[in-house]
Structure formats: C-alpha cells, structure tokens
Interface confidence: low
Amino acid sequence: QPPPPPPDATCHQVRSFFQRLQPGLKWVPETPVPGSDLQVCLPKGPTCCSRKMEEKYQLTARLNMEQLLQSASMELKFLIIQNAAVFQEAFEIVVRHAKNYTNAMFKNNYPSLTPQAFEFVGEFFTDVSLYILGSDINVDDMVNELFDSLFPVIYTQLMNPGLPDSALDINECLRGARRDLKVFGNFPKLIMTQVSKSLQVTRIFLQALNLGIEVINTTDHLKFSKDCGRMLTRMWYCSYCQGLMMVKPCGGYCNVVMQGCMAGVVEIDKYWREYILSLEELVNGMYRIYDMENVLLGLFSTIHDSIQYVQKNAGKLTTTIGKLCAHSQQRQYR
Amino acid sequence: SAYYPEDLFIDKKVLKVAHVEHEETLSSRRRELIQKLKSFISFYSALPGYICSHSPVAENDTLCWNGQELVERYSQKAARNGMKNQFNLHELKMKGPEPVVSQIIDKLKHINQLLRTMSVPKGRVLDKNLDEEGFESGDCGDDEDECIGGSGDGMMKVKNQLRFLAELAYDLDVDDVPGNNQQATPKDNEISTFHNLGNVH
C-alpha cells in the first residue's frame, strides 16, 4: 500500500478551497494542527481542519445531498405533475362535453322541458366535477336528485300539459312518486351503477397521481440525520483536511454511505413499486362502465331512453299519479 | 325516433366513427403514463447508486478515499467503509425513516389499498344484480364491448377516442340554448389539450 502523501505544510491549498465555501472567514489553521477537537474528520496526524470547518463541511455536504436528491427525482416529478394536470383538465372537458350533449338532447328532443332541464343537468354535472376532484358527494344522491327534479317537469310539460304552472304542491308529490312508482324503470339504477363506478375509478386515479407528486415532494425535501451528515462529510471533505484536494471517494464506500443515509427513504421502495403496479392494474380496468369518458358521453342517450320509457307508460302512470297526487292537484285548482 | 345531438349518428343508434391509426385517446394516454412510470419502478431502491454515480467517485483513478485514508481502488481497504469504531452503520440503518417518510409510507399504503379495491375484475360489464333485475329490452351482453345504454331503443356504442370527442363538439348546437352558459364548441386550448396529450414527457 503506498504511503499517504505528506500533508500540505502550510494548509494553503485547504485555505483557498475553504474560502470558496465560506468567504472571508479565518477558520483554517495557517499550518497543520493536532485537531484533537475534531469529531468527524478524526486525524491520524496533523490536520488542516478545525471544528468550525467541520461544521461548515457538514452543512455543505447536506446541501449537496439535497441537491443530488432533487436532481435525481426531477424527471419523475415532472412526469407525474404534468400528467396529473393534463388528466384533470381532460376529465373536466369530458364532463363539459357530456353536459353539452345532454343539453343538446333536451333541446332537440324535448324543447318544452328547457330551460328547467338545463338547470338540473347543470347541477348534476357540477356535482360530477366536484366528486372527481374529491368532494364528499354521494353519486346515488346526485342521480336521484337529477331524476327527482326532471320528473315533475316531464309530468307537467309532456304527460299532463294541462296542469297550471304553479305546480309547487304537486311537485313534491311527483318527486316522491318518481321513486315509489319507478317511473323511469331501472334507468336511474343503471346510471347510478355506471356513473358511480366510472367516477370512483377516475377519482382514485387522480388521487393516486396527486399522491405520487406528494411522495416525490416529500423525498425531494428530506432532511438527513446527524449521522448521515457526518458520514457524507467524511466521504466528501475529510480528505481535504489532509491536503488531498483532488482525491475522490471509493465507489464501494460511497454506496455503503448512501445506503446508510437513504435507509429511511429506501423503505418507500416496496410501497412505491406496489403503487405503480396497482395504478397499472387500475388503468387496465378503466374501460366500459369503468371509463368515465365512455359513460358520461353516453349519458344523454340513456337519459333520453329513460324519458322515452316514461312516455311509453304515460297512460298508466298518469292515472296512477292522478290518484296518488289528487289531494295536491285539488288544492292547486281551487 | 330521437333526434340526436350530432350528425355522426348514421342510424340514430350506433355512432360510427372511422378508426384512425395512432389516434391519441385518454386510455392510450393513461397506458403511456403507466409505461413511463414503470421505468421508474426501482426509483427508490436505485437512489443510493444513482447519487453515487452523479457525485464525484473514483472511476479511472488508481487511488481513492475510503473515509480515513488514501487507498488503491481495487484493494480490500477500498471496499471497507472506513467507519470502524466511529459510527455504527447498522444502527443508522436500524433507525426508522424520518417521520415525514413514515407518514408518506402510510399514505402510500392507504392509496395502494384503495387502488387494489377499485381494480376492475376482468370481463365484467355490469353488476350481476343489475342484469338480473332486467330491462325492458336490449340488456348489455358481455360481448358488446362498449355498451353503455340501457334499453334497446337508445343503445349506443362510443369509440373512446379524444379526437372524436373534440371533433364531435363542433357538431353540437347548443350555443344559442337559453340558460346554457357552456359553449358546445370547445375553445382552441381544449382541442389542443386533447391532441397534445402525447407531448407530455
């Protein structure tokens, strides 16, 4: 093994390097000293380092480490941030188009139901957007509210246009009758199933992407432990104390130090792998009724079918509702 | 029969859109994202190695620093960590992660559980109980890939493609509908969102 080169007799090289780290401070000994106060760069002989220099090296080592960590995650972070933004925007646009399709269906097929239908459709799709973004809304309630609101308008405008406009009393009765008599058949339940499944998946997909960003941000801004700071200092800077300015750490040594410093971070690995594989599984299943684009853009058709179903059974329904809501109607006509 | 909100309905039931090769869709964009994410699947386990390879380490030099002294790069001493009697690396590794890391692990565990719960069983279209309740007509069969309608009259197949989505918007005629603030024709930036999904790297 070659003998170590003699330390810098004057500490001049060390001083000039250290001045770049800490301009104007006279912490570097003029000539090598015993260094008995050192805690990290424990000397085998005279050293050009002081306790204050060690502290500065530790700070610099930690900053280096933080920068290396941030540059390591930059590409991944950008990938997830960009995609989270793109998908969120795309989902919002799908919702907007789905709303427009539904409004157009009402305008073209049932002009007498507008503008009330537009209002109800607007509220429904606003709730859809809020749900996707994580709002605490029940999808079944959203769908029920849409059909509860639509039926009184369908009844008074399409099925029984002779009723007076001020049908406030009968409206409440009609909302109740809508569910009791299953006036839309199984369509509300079908829509509930399709919308809830597709929106749940969409929502969890966005949540997962946003958590991905949070994971990277967390590890991006990690602080390192004292022990890690000392090990990094010893690896990157202690050689300077011996005047060895150009020497680099051994590769195997670096790996050991990094594994020690990153022990906590590496614990994320298992869950990170699982996260990506679980996300892949979810994405593979995002089709048919689990694909919000597919479901929402077809809603206008299903809603149209549900209204046709009501019209097909209009005779039977009008008679039943006439009896059921007779009390409300009598009060209205008085 | 119903007047549908666009001219692309040929027979008023089935939406027929010519399939364009390499068309950018939401689902293809999702799959592309997953493929890119999978290239980062070992990100955390590879971090120590990555940082060493991006910080100064002796590669071509004969001598290297082992934390205590200058040694030959291929010697036994170089392989040792140079920390004997100073810091116990084992103890350092035994310490759990910093609390913020523990907290993020907990969040990952939670989202992974949710993702697994939400993953769709292969080959399922509708819940069994829905099929059993039955519809007036035209229930969806397993072989009907994109079936989303309820009754036969309004059955509709949708090609899940964003280009179709963007183009279709032009044919909607709700701009002049009273009480409807949403314009049917998407703004330029919306269309570019759809077409440029592939530009995100």
Epitope: C228 | M94, Q103, D106
Partner: antibody, heavy 124, light 108 residues
Framework: QVQLQESGGGVVQPGRSLRLSCAAS????????MHWVRQAPGKGLEWVAV????????YYADSVKGRFTISRDNSKNTLYLQMNSLRAEDTAVYYC??????????????????????WGQGTT | DVVMTQSPLSLPVTPGEPASISCRSS???????????LDWYVQKPGQSPQRLIY???IRASGVPDRFSGSGSGTDFTLKISRVEADDVGVYYC?????????FGQGTK
C-alpha cells in the same frame, strides 16, 4: 419552553357534553401527534385517544369510542377532545401529551426520540 | 388489546438501595425494525406524568443515569441503581406498539 395547557373541564350531568382544549406553545405543533390520557381519582393512567400530526388519523380507547372525538386546529396550535354522552366513569383528570417523534438540532439534522415527552398539568 | 401487567404494585425502598420494577405484556412489543415499543413514566405526588425511558431502554433527556430500562419482547424491567428520596412516585410502563396504547397498573 414547550408547554401544554389544558382547559374546559368541569362538572356536568351524565349524558351531557363537554369540550376540552389543550393550548400548545414552544414547539411546531403541526409536526407532532398528540394524545389525551386520563386518570380517574385514585386510579392509574388510561390512554384515551391520539391524533396524527395533520389530523388525518385518529384512534380511540374502546371505552370512549363513538362518544369522544379528538381533533386539532394546527392554525391555532390547539388540541381538542369533544366528550358526548358522558358517564360517571368518565370522571378523571384529563392530560394532553405531545408525542416526541423527532427533533432538529441547530444545524438542521434530525434525530429520533419517542414516547410522550411533554404532558400538560391536567384538567378535571 | 395488549394487556400490561406490573409487579410489584407497591415497592418500599430505603434511600441508597437499588430498586427494580417488572412489566410484562400479553404480546411481544418487539417491532419488525428491532425496537421494543415500551415506555416508562413516573408520576410524582401532585404532578403530571413524565417520561423516563422510551423504546425499552433509551433514557429520556434529563433523566439521571441511575435509571435504566432493559428487556425485550414481553418482559421488561426498570431499575434504579440507588434510590433517592425524590424518586417517590408511581411508575407506569406503557406499550406504544399498537392502538389502543395501554398502561400497566402502576407501581408505587
């Protein structure tokens, strides 16, 4: 210095409600989990509830589950315990305690410590 | 729930003599990371509890080195090498491995 100050205790009839507060000072409240522990007259310590640093996770002792709710307002550095449907056996001194999880020294490095490292003086 | 059992429940000691308190858990408190999630607290007369030992054997800051914690898994011991008059109080062990956290009955 690090301090926890409980308040809100008092005498109420069984079945009624009470809300305890714990004002924290001298540390970054939003970084630490917080506990409520109680001690019935002449008896030992009984752990009641814990809330995570951000309020997202809460755990309760079986004896209070469904009746007590732990919450926190990080903007006010305050921990709360909402006690509903109170029973005679809930009579106790209630302590709030900070869970010591880690600390940062002056140079910004962190190190660990565990356990409930700071306790309030209690409210009855 | 994890049941914590302390013995003895009362321990008369003469100042200068050693003292030892045992704590047994109904299940292992050894975490997969190798930590024993057991803490020791003391409550002096008229005061709030204060932490003595955490993770089975680590002395809390400011605690005299007369106090030591040992043990692993289900059996733990708190030792005071030389008792002082100021050490009077009730000593509790507590497991923090899983919710609900549970205390021993206390040793006076």
């Amino acid at each position: 210095q690090v301090q926890l100050q409980e308040s809100g205790g008092g005498v109420v009839q069984p079945g009624r409600s009470l809300r305890l507060s714990c004002a924290a000072s001298g540390f970054t409240f939003s970084s630490y989990a917080m506990h409520w522990v109680r001690q019935a007259p002449g008896k030992g310590l009984e752990w009641v509830a814990v809330i995570s640093y951000d309020g997202s996770n809460k755990y309760y002792a079986d004896s209070v589950k469904g009746r007590f709710t732990i919450s926190r307002d990080n903007s006010k550095n305050t921990l709360y315990l909402q006690m509903n449907s109170l029973r005679a056996e809930d009579t106790a001194v209630y302590y709030c305690a900070k869970e010591g999880t880690y600390y940062y020294d002056s140079s910004g490095y962190w190190d660990y410590y565990y356990g409930m490292d700071v306790w309030g003086q209690g409210t009855t | 729930d994890v049941v914590m059992t302390q013995s003895p429940l009362s321990l008369p000691v003469t100042p200068g003599e050693p003292a030892s308190i045992s704590c047994r858990s109904s299940q292992s408190l050894l975490d997969s990371d190798g930590y024993n999630f057991l803490d020791w607290y003391v409550q002096k007369p008229g005061q709030s509890p204060q932490r003595l030992i955490y993770l089975g054997s680590i002395r809390a800051s400011g605690v005299p080195d007369r106090f030591s914690g040992s043990g692993s898994g289900t059996d733990f011991t708190l030792k005071i090498s030389r008792v002082e008059a100021d050490d009077v109080g009730v000593y509790y062990c507590m497991q923090a491995l899983q919710t609900p956290w549970t205390f021993g009955q206390g040793t006076k």
